[in-house]
Interface confidence: low
């Protein structure tokens, strides 16, 4: 069936060195554990994180990104699935787009991660 | 080490189609880009579009839009280019093009290359 | 679509000579730049790729800089095998070479 997919609408922000969520989700809801989930880095990207087959392909994914993601599926069931960033670095910023592949339907969705320095909001005294 | 290896010469006629083959080995295919450059006589290098087999869909540059189609079977890790309504003026060596594993993010590549193919229009 | 001024398109050098060839962006690309080497009925091969970066193999005599719009490709010491025409390339989106620089025998 189709469905589109649905990410968050304004830029997510993050602090070099924490971890960040980048939720999406098929509307409307369904089981999406059969489906292919992923994040890529547009235009031309490198893989950050795929799921496929019922598990997570960590060799397919971008070594920048190895050892730092997490596909939070909790809520797989219900076609919300969430991406989970550790250690967050500059050149995390930008463009990020997720998508679900049922057999060969897919569709995505856009998000902008903004990444800032801690140590800039750091009030003196 | 990452290796491509192309299809053979065509000789085609004008407003015929002519597609070229490029089959990687020694690597991960699905993740990473696989760009189709040609060159003709005497020329410079130009980029004509680009794909990342696992998600399937294509990028083209303008210049192109609407002739080439780009596509790859994961399955023989092969990437494909058909180029259409050919004119004398496609004659070139077209080259596909991969990027290495390890690179930055965001990083199209261009770092492996195939051995070309060349491909004469002529009536 | 962003455009690659290479300069210049030809350069006459002799073994042993510092040779340079600049390359423009019509706008920023960060350091998305890489600079290809291609001799004559050969497919091109990587030498810089993030517009500094060396590729592994290639000789330390080349080298690259710059970021933003302007990027140099640099060759200290020319070496006979080094006489071939060199192109940059961007890929901060649609991708674009220049037009390449010959280096020849002077």
């Known amino acids: 069936g189709q469905f589109r997919v649905i990410g968050p609408r304004h830029p997510i922000r993050a602090l070099v060195g924490d971890e960040v969520e980048l939720p999406c989700r098929i509307s409307p809801g369904k089981n999406a554990t059969g489906m292919e989930v992923g994040w890529y880095r547009p235009p031309f990207s490198r893989v950050v994180h795929l799921y496929r087959n019922g598990k997570d392909q960590d060799g397919d994914q971008a070594p920048e990104y190895r050892g730092r993601t997490e596909l939070l599926k909790d809520a797989i069931g219900e076609g919300k699935v969430t991406l989970r960033i550790r250690n967050v670095r500059f050149s995390d910023e930008g463009g990020f787009t997720c998508f679900f592949r049922d057999h060969s339907y897919q569709e995505e969705a856009a998000m902008e991660l903004k990444v800032e320095d801690p140590f800039y909001w750091v009030s003196p005294g | 080490q990452m290796q491509l290896v192309q299809s053979g010469a065509e000789v085609k006629k004008p407003g015929s189609s002519v597609k070229v083959s490029c089959k990687a080995s020694?690597?991960?295919?699905?993740?990473?880009?696989i760009s189709w450059v040609r060159q003709a006589p005497g020329q410079g290098l130009e980029w004509m579009g680009g794909?990342?087999?696992?998600?399937?869909?294509?990028n083209y540059a303008q210049k192109f839009q609407g002739r080439v189609t780009i596509t790859a079977d994961e399955s023989t890790s092969t990437a494909y280019m058909e180029l259409s309504s050919l004119r004398s003026e496609d004659t070139a060596v077209y080259y596909c093009?991969?990027?290495?594993?390890?690179?930055?993010?965001?990083?199209?590549?261009?770092?492996?290359w195939g051995q070309g193919t060349l491909v004469t229009v002529s009536s | 679509d962003i455009q690659m001024t290479q300069s210049p398109s030809t350069l006459s050098a002799s073994v042993g000579d510092r040779v340079t060839t600049t390359c423009r962006a019509s706008q920023g690309i960060s350091n998305y730049l890489a600079w290809f080497q291609q001799k004559p009925g050969k497919a091109p091969k990587s030498l810089i790729y993030?517009?500094?970066s060396l590729q592994s193999g290639v000789p330390s005599r080349f080298s690259g800089g710059g970021s933003g719009t302007d990027f140099t490709l640099t060759i200290n010491s020319l070496q006979p095998e080094d006489f071939a025409t060199y192109y940059c390339l961007h890929d901060y989106n649609y991708p674009t070479f220049g037009q390449g620089t010959k280096v020849e025998i002077k």
């Open positions: 794909i990342i087999p696992i998600f399937g869909t294509a």
């Open positions: 993030a517009a500094s």
């Open positions: 093009a991969r990027a290495r594993e390890g690179l930055l993010v965001n990083y199209y590549g261009m770092d492996v």
């Open positions: 020694g690597g991960t295919f699905s993740s990473y880009a």
